[in-house]
Interface confidence: low
């Protein structure tokens, strides 16, 4: 007896972890036996080379060559989403459509959201080592390592919450070097090593003694960047101080620091950081291009001693450590509009005095660059030729131009076609958006920007054809 198709096994969401192939299953019943057709983001798959999809006789879809596994690039996670697959089973009595299954890639960014810091804790008291793991897909698991070995979490004594390690009762054996390790199927990332010192509790019956302590902050020195921190180190300073007064009643010392405001302005609030030292210590958490005030305060349990004198230090400006964001190209009347958003504040590394915009050679614009002064975040470039326009933008501080954004390209004739044919379609393509199409076309992982530009005319022509086929 004839019957319409029914999906028995729906494709499942899955993570592509390479090197391949990825498989999507679909099984259907029906009489006559239905034929299976697959769609990606609602568009039928051609299955004709060089399409990397292949259909097995049982209806299973193989994705032979998915894009390279996600990785951090210029501090930005690549899209983890390769698309939503659905299968259709059809016979003469009708068509059944499966649930959509999302195929995504594993990604783990380089940068920790919060790095653990050196600290001093007191025996019997609780302390927390903070760690904000890098963004990842799937969400990374966090483990803690101590002195080069994984830390075995003891129920009731250790708690890990959101990546941070809470130690309920400090013991002398907790002293050591701690590291937070984030792991997912894209790999693993290690935080900086944080030194934890554990002190014996000292109950002074006379906190009055603490009030008699005098602290002279003698030196604040900018430290050489740690090569282990990579090409964009954050500044750190070395504080050294002298203590006079009663016999060292202070259990610990805290650095207080703030950015200096203009004369007559209201002072910024003081930030506090427990120091892992008794006469000198390193202090991080600062930003390039700022003027800072520093002082040191002794404490013993809950009792605080008087603050030291204040020392000033100007941290030099550096080039911005991140590119401008959301760079877009839009066609105008005989012009091309470039616009962007400044880099995140923590990456300014000084005062942004303007922006540098480059056009890339080998396109319709000759190689050129423009300087945009001040806070303006757009530029109008006059042009009368159709063709492809590719630009990069970098932020500029007193130290020079920072890293440029990824190239963004606009195909003028295509932008006009789109404006008339597909008003709901998103704006210009970035090379990142094109890369997936180009990899599929050329049956291999993306060959880098230079190669993309070398073969640009062919690639752009084919990528457009491919894009229209998919959308």
């Amino acid at each position: 007896q004839d019957s319409p198709p029914q999906i028995l096994v729906h494709p499942q969401d899955q993570l592509f972890q390479g090197p391949g192939p990825a498989r999507m299953s679909c099984q259907a019943s029906g009489q006559p036996p239905p034929t299976i057709r697959w769609l990606l983001n609602g568009q039928p798959l051609s299955m004709v080379p060089p399409d990397p999809h292949h259909l097995l006789p049982d209806g299973t879809l193989l994705l032979l060559q998915p894009p390279a596994r996600g990785h951090a690039h210029d501090g930005q996670a690549l899209s983890t989403d390769l698309g939503v697959y659905t299968c259709e089973a059809s016979n003469r009595l009708g068509t059944a459509v499966s649930r959509g299954a999302r195929l995504s890639v594993a990604v783990l960014r380089e940068d920790f959201q919060i790095q653990p810091r050196d600290m001093v804790a007191v025996v019997g008291e609780q302390f927390t080592l903070e760690c904000g793991p890098p963004w990842g897909h799937p969400e990374p698991t966090v483990s803690w390592w101590k002195d080069g070995k994984p830390l075995a979490l003891q129920p009731g004594r250790h708690t890990v919450s959101g990546g941070s390690l809470l130690m309920a009762r400090a013991e002398k054996s907790d002293e050591g070097t701690y590291m937070c390790v984030a792991t997912n199927s894209a790999g693993h990332r290690e935080s900086r090593a944080a030194r934890v010192s554990i002190q014996e509790p000292q109950d002074y019956t006379e906190p009055v003694e603490l009030l008699a302590v005098r602290i002279q902050l003698e030196n604040v020195t900018l430290l050489n960047p740690d090569p282990a921190e990579g090409p964009k180190p954050r500044p750190a300073v070395w504080l050294s101080w002298k203590v006079s007064g009663p016999a060292a009643p202070a259990q610990s010392y805290t650095a207080l620091f703030r950015t200096q405001t203009a004369p007559g302005g209201q002072g910024a609030p003081w930030a506090e950081e427990l120091l892992a030292g008794w006469q000198s210590a390193e202090l991080g958490g600062l930003h390039w291009g700022q003027d800072y005030e520093f002082k040191v305060r002794p404490s013993s349990g809950r009792a605080r001693g008087p603050d030291s004198n204040v020392l000033l230090l100007r941290l030099p400006e550096k080039v911005p450590s991140a590119p401008p964001q959301e760079v877009t190209l839009k066609p105008g009347n005989g012009t091309v509009f470039v616009s962007w958003v400044p880099p995140p504040a923590e990456n300014h590394n000084g005062i942004i005095r303007g922006y540098q915009v480059w056009s890339l050679g080998n396109t319709s614009l000759p190689p050129a660059n423009w300087t945009v002064v001040g806070e303006q975040t757009q530029l109008e470039i006059a042009t009368h030729m159709p063709g492809s326009y590719c630009v990069q933008v970098a932020a500029v501080t007193g130290a020079g131009a920072g890293e440029p954004s990824r190239p963004v390209c606009l195909l003028l004739e295509q932008a006009m076609e789109r404006a008339t044919q597909e008003p709901s379609e998103h704006g210009p393509w970035t090379l990142e958006q094109l890369r997936v199409d180009l990899e599929v076309l050329f049956q291999g992982p993306g060959s880098g920007l230079n190669d993309i530009f070398e073969a640009q005319k062919i690639e752009w022509h084919e990528a457009r054809a491919h894009h229209h086929h998919h959308h």
Partner: antibody
Framework: QIQLQESGPGLVKPSQSLSLTCSVT?????????WTWIRQFPGNNLEWMGY???????DYNPSLTSRISITRDTSRNQFFLQLESVTTQDTATYYC????????????WGQGTMVTVSS | QPVLTQSPSASASLGASVKLTCTLN???????IGWYQQHRDKPPKYVMF???????SKADGIPDRFSGSSSGADRYLTISNIQAEDEAIYFC?????????????FGSGTHFTVL
Amino acid sequence: QIQLQESGPGLVKPSQSLSLTCSVTGYSISSGSLWTWIRQFPGNNLEWMGYISYAGGIDYNPSLTSRISITRDTSRNQFFLQLESVTTQDTATYYCATPGGYPFHFDYWGQGTMVTVSS
Amino acid sequence: QPVLTQSPSASASLGASVKLTCTLNSQFSTYNIGWYQQHRDKPPKYVMFVKGDGGHSKADGIPDRFSGSSSGADRYLTISNIQAEDEAIYFCGADYNNAGQYGCVFGSGTHFTVL
């Protein structure tokens, strides 16, 4: 893909030392993880012997501490097991293994090498 | 350190279900464990991580027929719709920390036979 391969003599005389090498491909042993030796006795029981971590930290099974040593050569991406004063009780299949995520859950294993202790 | 107890053998029919048990000694009843599958003449293969609260996390490529759960000091590996290739020895393993010494112990293994 991480791959591990054990190598070393299949026959050792009692009271001598047993030396095995684990060669790792697809991942640097100084980049992460715990590089572990596990053995399986003829009755199928598994015994964790010890590890050297990517940072050089070492822990051994307390029952073996007096006669085990695990070392590494990061330039050759290998780590080694040395077991002194062996007896017939050390006859086993020796595996090197490493976890992929959670520290003591071993996702990657070598094929194993059978070592017989006999005179 | 923890002691993990497994029954020596278990069996079930093709297409049926089986629940293998790994029991921790009482002072370690909150510990997480890992399950491993070992076919003849092959190294053990990591199957999943079972937490003290019953949550579990499967290794890549492990079919949905395998699941984990927990009750008190017992950790379970359930195999449903049993296939011939599921015949193997199943081991559980747990890590421990003893005065800063970190290590791992295994259960003695359950020989699982498909009837």
